[in-house]
Interface confidence: low
Amino acid sequence: RGVFRRDAHKSEVAHRFKDLGEENFKALVLIAFAQYLQQCPFEDHVKLVNEVTEFAKTCVADESAENCDKSLHTLFGDKLCTVATLRETYGEMADCCAKQEPERNECFLQHKDDNPNLPRLVRPEVDVMCTAFHDNEETFLKKYLYEIARRHPYFYAPELLFFAKRYKAAFTECCQAADKAACLLPKLDELRDEGKASSAKQRLKCASLQKFGERAFKAWAVARLSQRFPKAEFAEVSKLVTDLTKVHTECCHGDLLECADDRADLAKYICENQDSISSKLKECCEKPLLEKSHCIAEVENDEMPADLPSLAADFVESKDVCKNYAEAKDVFLGMFLYEYARRHPDYSVVLLLRLAKTYETTLEKCCAAADPHECYAKVFDEFKPLVEEPQNLIKQNCELFEQLGEYKFQNALLVRYTKKVPQVSTPTLVEVSRNLGKVGSKCCKHPEAKRMPCAEDYLSVVLNQLCVLHEKTPVSDRVTKCCTESLVNRRPCFSALEVDETYVPKEFNAETFTFHADICTLSEKERQIKKQTALVELVKHKPKATKEQLKAVMDDFAAFVEKCCKADDKETCFAEEGKKLVAASQAALGL
């Protein structure tokens, strides 16, 4: 029943071209190239893609033609290495071209930049966008793929095709509407927000595979799929996990054509075997391919089978526990994880993985003891504190969120995290804390049974952003420790960090707190970011400042901005009142 068992193909490039069709082939090659060479101009990438496509067509016509038997890595790598400005633009990445496959591709992967030095994407006027869309729809959509892919080098490529389809549909519909802006802008905002979330989720999957290995990813997948498909047999879940791991390994490894092709095959398999997987798949399976795959990935959990027996019987009370464990450790632990997860859609995946790890550690210890059964008899009691810790944390933070609202809740987290890891750059602290703060509006509205999977699994995604950004320029041993020691314990590790007492406060710099009239024309979100940036800098100057002191300064700051934005001579107001504000803040904080 292996979805991916295929006959050998003389030409891999011809095989993928035929499977995917020309448009998808070209789109995926463009994404792959833009994710590798993030600084290259659009036109250069289009030229490379067209050359690869023409070559692929010759291989479709004759699979025995020259070079058609080469691997995709060889073909694509050779093409990337023809870029004339590789050394000037990318520096040491050019050294990758001296290597042979597979080392060359590994080298390119290592040079992917999670935070490339690219200008922020500015949205043109709606009429300008609609004209560009109508003038050349194909180029317009390619440009979208290129701009997203180069800024998000691990974006899940087949899912980016789905976003591009929705992007196209938005313009197709809205550029004909009476009020184009009212139709288009909300759709573009939604795509932007969903796109950022999708990118971050995929980044965690790739980090899981690349930093912690296939076993860690498979464990995550067993837990998640068992929650989602609790009626499926263990063998079925295992098969899906194997196939899903292959898909994500390929995409995270830059093998985007294989990834998209295998993802389509997996969706096809799931839909052909709905009856043994889940009762919730019917609607998804009626959709076209890209929507179908997206829908399956987001499908709600199926209902748990009635009358599931107690877990204790097989995993604690049975005399064969150590025998079963010794015979096939990973299979037995996989079954434990499957059985626990299908019974607990109310737990986060990371909590389920912590429980499985505790169970594994206990068996390792007890199965070597004189009386194994006596030793592991109380293993389930060890789970209680592990379950209660995230429950309590979520309860406290949701109460705080409900009391403060999103913006002030973000500020509380900004202060908390800046005090924990003040060495981290201010833009990273602002970005990560803002995202951590969004957990409130995203998850606190849910009933108890859905809060933990929503909150803790979302926090895992956000903290991974911190980890990958920090890895690029490491500045804090504490961040490195929390990020690298255990994937499932990252959140508890960060939660447990106290104020960093070793930190030497930053020198006060008035320039950091000098503001100009341009702040008045910013959107509400941009204005918040300016204020939150100032807040982080304040904490870095005065890490021992109390909540009350910081609140007073931030209230003064908000009043100052409001006052000067209403003034006739805004710039003069910002200059004069700004000096007063800095002096007052210094006094209030004892700087």
């Epitope: 448009e23 998808n24 076209p288 391919l289 890209l290």
Partner: nanobody
């Protein structure tokens, strides 16, 4: 794979009409959207009209009100009714289809509008 074959092109005077057809064969159950594109000599290919499986259509301003796209699912055929033709409509017209992108293309049929 899907095969597409266009027909109905030819020479027509300005102000005249023409009806293009596109016959689809192969794995047509996967087709969700069908479209017409055109390419004039020395110019970029441009979008002319699209129709989804559900029947919703869209057109660029340059042909709106003059061209009508339709499909006959029972015959697996796509049509483009072109009225009030102008000299600038001269081009090779391509039929395209696909589940998501218009990834399958015909060979094209030439339409010449000239007096």
């Amino acid at each position: 794979q899907v095969q597409l074959v266009e027909s109905g092109g030819g020479l027509v005077q300005p102000g005249g009409s023409l009806r293009l057809s596109c016959a689809a064969s192969g794995s047509i159950e996967s087709i969700n959207r069908m479209a017409w594109y055109r390419q004039a000599p020395g110019k970029q290919r441009e979008f002319v009209a699209r129709i989804s499986k559900g029947g919703s259509t869209n057109y660029p301003d340059s042909v709106k009100g003059r061209f009508t796209i339709s499909r006959d699912n029972s015959k697996n055929t796509l049509y483009l009714q072109m009225n009030s033709l102008r000299a600038e409509d001269t081009a090779v017209y391509y039929c395209a289809a696909g589940p998501v992108w218009e990834q399958f293309w015909g060979q094209g049929t030439l339409v010449t509008v000239s007096s």
